[in-house]
């Protein structure tokens, strides 16, 4: 799996996970989140050579058609597979409210 | 939705719905399906700006996050959405086999 | 039970030849895009060479006129043979069917040295 255990411990540049912390109030502009202050989101990038964790039949067949034509510019990307949630503690007045925001966190990733 | 109805009557360079033909002797070298010669098999590409088809809350985290950064090499990537199957002809010696192939046909698109 | 199994792995010196070999069962092999792989410690998986059913051949830059991926339908055989092998060619050569599916071998080790 192209997750941190296998991404963040090889030098890749094939489709892998890559580490991104986002500061809600300096990354995006954000104040209306107390808490956390940010988090590691994560995100996918990298190139998706022949057969590298190619997710559907299109993505293999797109994989391969790429290396036959390399000129060609369609060829499959990296993106992510497995999302996890990110519980976070906001005000609406006085009144603090948890909320689960769900695909927040990029565990994983294909070429797709 | 970034599928043929709204793609293919628009120019658009953010992320789309491509056509693509792929003949598989061609194209892929394969040999061994005998129907059909080929098949649209299209493909998805372009750029995903703000909140442009971002399928979840990370990816338009991801496009805020690039918006704001655009220097940063994190951003959202345009892949399939919808897929169809392909339904083929070939032979074992000479015995007809007729397969469908799942997820061979790209019928939409998204930012993921 | 499908199954790749390569052999023809060894040690060689820098200059020399060597020619792997792919057994295939369980899948139709005639049909099949048959490719090598090779994985050096601390480095990422890459395609050496392909072969697709049609004989369409594709190789890496770095072994482009060094190897030549080949098949043998009625054996169910794939081979890549590698000349003038260096130091860098060392690495765990894998072998790689392609047909509806991607289904792989346990690799062999190649080891390049003086």
């Known amino acids: 799996a192209l997750d941190a255990a296998y991404c963040f411990r090889n030098v890749q540049d094939n489709c892998c996970l890559r580490p991104l912390y986002i500061d809600f109030k300096r990354d995006l502009g954000w104040k209306w989140i107390h808490e956390p202050k940010g988090y590691n989101a994560n995100f996918c990038a990298g190139a998706c050579p022949y057969l590298w964790s190619s997710d559907t039949q299109h993505s293999r067949v797109l994989s391969l058609y790429n290396t036959i034509n390399p000129e060609a510019s369609a060829s499959p990307c990296c993106v992510s597979q497995d999302l996890e949630p990110l519980t976070i503690l906001y005000y609406i007045g006085k009144t603090p409210k948890i909320e689960q925001l769900s695909n927040m966190i990029v565990k994983s990733c294909k070429c797709s | 939705a970034l599928d043929a109805a709204y793609c293919f009557r628009n120019v658009q360079d953010n992320c789309c719905l491509r056509p693509l033909y792929i003949d598989f002797k061609r194209d892929l070298g394969w040999k061994w399906i005998h129907e059909p010669k080929g098949y649209n098999a299209n493909f998805c590409a372009g750029a995903c700006p703000y909140l442009w088809s971002s399928d979840t809350q990370h990816s338009r985290v991801l496009s805020l996050y690039n918006t704001i950064n655009p220097e940063a090499s994190a951003s959202p990537c345009c892949v399939s959405q919808d897929l169809e199957p392909l339904t083929i002809l070939y032979y074992i010696g000479k015995t007809p086999k007729i397969e469908q192939l799942s997820n061979m046909i790209v019928k939409s698109c998204k930012c993921s | 039970q499908l199954q790749l199994v390569e052999s023809g792995g060894g040690l060689v010196q820098p200059g020399e030849s060597l020619r792997l070999s792919c057994a295939a069962s369980g899948i139709i092999f005639s049909a099949s895009t048959m490719a090598w792989f090779r994985q050096a410690p601390g480095k990422q998986r890459e395609l050496v060479a392909l072969?697709?059913?049609?004989?369409?051949?594709n190789y890496a830059d770095s072994v482009k006129g060094r190897f030549t991926i080949s098949r043998d339908n009625a054996e169910n055989t794939v081979y890549l043979q590698m000349t003038e092998l260096k130091f860098e060619d060392t690495a765990v050569y894998y072998c790689?069917?392609?047909?509806?599916?991607?289904?792989w071998g346990q690799g062999t080790q190649v080891t390049v040295s003086s």
């Open positions: 790689n069917a392609f047909w509806l599916k991607a289904y």
């Open positions: 072969i697709t059913d049609g004989d369409r051949t």
